[in-house]
């Protein structure tokens, strides 16, 4: 199933090398290429305790760990200014909008009973508005904002009780929104949930240092995803006819010495320990990569034969995130003494070789600018052009089956451990203003043009 990825660094003759003539490719993306943009609920919604919403682990983490951040109450206030978000989407002309549902906005203590009516109404209104505009919703069920009650009562994702509770929440979302949603994402970047939430403590819930907990959390996230996929596949897909995946994030890495077998081996293990950790059970053979099982034997849980069978193939496409959160700060174990690189094209080639050329949705891509930069975000344009060029080359030259691209993010918002010190939006938001106007940045104009032309014209 896996292991072919290392050919990327060996410069396998079957892999088209990037020569001078290909440094920039003037070409269009495939017809009907899926252009989109995304946000995460906790990052943009604000109103963290308004209208019956319960606290999330991030609301708590902000108050306990991020001392100079008052709360996400500032944010971009998407909960209040939904119409402004819709106008921003109209301006760019996207085919889809990827957003996440705040679990505690629907179920304040995480347990599925009667949903919070105002929360339900908000997401229903948003979905109706998107459908009306012919914008396809891609809905993420979990973008890190676990209801605080589940953390306090069960220990969060460390406890496998959460698996069934998450499945109940997913079931509710499928029932209520599935008529309007054809693309579902269960969990956004589980690597960061496990590694930074329980390893470095840089993310909520802020636990650190216990490797066994890190891998237990990863294990439960994979099992939760798989359970939801089977649930959707059996009970909802037949009549809703949608697709479901999990967004997996990664860095990219290059060997110190391109001809050195050991350095190439370390690069392979670097990718395996981050992306393979989750991709192998889901997109591969149903188990953890062999190298991880050897290296991490004392902390990595095991899948039974039945569970391996259950995990395998539980994604309808490969949802891939490639952005700053997987690069800064990259854990030293993942770097393995090699050189991190922003080569998205090579990362896509690795996925192609490692997981048998799946259909790929780039579910998050973009970079960041300093918070002082307002609408003239030239660095963001440079990065976007570079990334999109790499995606285009991957499609046209390497025959990689990328079917969609999610620019990140629609709006400036709360950027996790960086809080409000960086901006990732294509629309500028002054967090101190009352009306939170969305002002298109240069990158918004640029992305709009890319979408209109479906690529790069000469």
């Amino acid at each position: 199933f896996s292991g072919d990825g290392r050919a990327i660094w060996s410069k396998n003759p079957n892999f088209t090398p990037v020569n001078e003539s290909q440094l920039f490719l003037y070409d269009t993306f495939p017809k009907n290429f899926f252009w989109g943009i995304g946000t995460g609920a906790l990052q943009v919604e604000g109103s963290w305790k308004k209208d019956g919403k319960g606290p999330s682990i991030w609301d708590h983490f902000i108050h306990t760990h991020l001392k100079n951040v008052s709360s996400t109450n500032g944010s971009s206030d998407s909960y209040i200014f939904l119409e402004k978000d819709l106008s921003a989407l109209d301006f760019i002309g996207v085919s889809f909008y990827q957003f996440s549902i705040s679990w505690p906005r629907l179920f304040p203590d995480g347990i599925v009973t009667v949903a919070n009516a105002k929360g339900l109404q908000y997401y229903s209104t948003l979905l109706d508005a998107l459908v009306l505009r012919n914008i396809e919703p891609i809905v993420t069920l979990y973008h890190w904002d676990l209801p605080l009650a589940l953390q306090e009562k069960y220990g969060g994702w460390k406890n496998d009780t959460i698996i069934d509770i998450f499945n109940d929440y997913a079931t509710y979302c499928f029932q209520m929104f599935g008529d309007r949603v054809k693309y579902w994402i269960t969990i956004h970047n589980p690597y960061l949930v496990a590694w930074h939430g329980y390893g470095t403590g840089m993310h909520a819930p802020g636990e650190k240092g216990n490797l066994a907990a890190v891998y237990t959390v990863g294990h439960n996230l994979i099992k939760a995803h798989s359970k939801v996929w089977h649930n959707y596949n059996t009970h909802f897909r037949p009549h809703q006819k949608g697709w479901l995946s999990i967004t997996l994030g990664s860095h990219w890495i290059e060997p110190n010495r391109s001809e050195n077998t050991m350095d190439i081996f370390k690069c392979q293990q670097s990718m395996v320990s981050v992306l393979g950790w989750f991709a192998n059970p889901i997109h591969g053979d149903g188990d953890y990569p062999e190298g991880m099982r050897k290296k991490l034997f004392s902390v990595l849980p095991i899948f039974s034969e039945a569970e391996k069978h259950e995990m395998r193939g539980t994604a309808d496409f490969f949802a891939f995130s490639f952005g700053p959160n997987n690069f800064k700060p990259l854990n030293t174990m993942a770097k393995m003494g090699q050189n991190v690189s922003l080569n998205l094209r090579e990362a896509l080639n690795w996925i192609k070789l490692e997981y048998n050329n799946p259909r790929i949705l780039i579910a998050e891509n973009g970079w960041f600018t300093d918070s002082r930069v307002k609408t003239e975000d030239t660095t963001a344009i440079y990065m976007m052009k570079n990334f999109l060029s790499q995606v285009l080359q991957a499609i046209r030259l390497d025959e990689i089956r990328v079917f969609g691209y999610t620019a990140w993010s629609l709006l400036d918002g709360f950027e996790w451990q960086d809080a409000y010190t960086i901006r990732r939006g294509l629309f500028y938001v002054d967090f101190n203003s009352k009306q939170k106007e969305r002002k298109p940045k240069s990158s918004a104009h640029y992305y709009k043009q890319i979408i209109r032309e479906n690529g790069f014209s000469l």
């Epitope: 490797l211 050897k294 290296k295 004392s298």
Partner: antibody, heavy 123, light 110 residues
Amino acid sequence: QVQLQESGPGLVKPSETLSLTCTVSGDSVSSGDNYWSWIRQPPGKGLEWIGFMFYSGSTNYNPSLKSRVTISLHTSKNQFSLRLSSVTAADTAVYYCGRYRSDWDYYYGMDVWGQGTTVTVSS
Amino acid sequence: QSVLTQPPSVSAAPGQKVTISCSGSSSNIGNNYVSWYQQLPGTAPKLLIYDNNKRPSGIPDRFSGSKSGTSATLGITGLQTEDEADYYCGTWDSSLSAVVFGGGTKLTVL
């Protein structure tokens, strides 16, 4: 080549604490692929794993001994140690220190052993 | 009572072949990697086979290891008198979070 050498008292009184030290040469106790281990072998019986410690400080102990065992690393001296409290005659054994190793490529198991030291629990 | 089960003893004549079995469960042998150790009389154990079937340098190719499902096997061909020793299998048990050994097999070269 890597060598391990156990040291400590050969006789311990019941209810007291057994303390042994293992001195490592040819490798570092702060190396990332190694779990520094203690194993024992009662007279005429098989091997019993006591526990090990990873360079990061995380430990795993035999569930049947867990409440009485402490393994510590002493990086400055390149040593690791075993403390077993409340000993009884059943703790009489040859005690071995070992290097349990696994990396991305191979799962080695206990690839280096000390020569063993006999500890008798008796009053 | 050991977590891994080995026959207490096996015997064979010099030059013959012998196999020693090691039986476990999915939480140990089934999902982890097996090592084999040789303990000559009065000495410390020595690693004989690692990673199910690999030999450390210096171990003759008369010794081999294999694994299938929840069982592992040590094979010794061309038996020599100096092979007379106790043999132990060992692995990690994910349920116990512990290293586990078999009870040991005494090999007698007749």
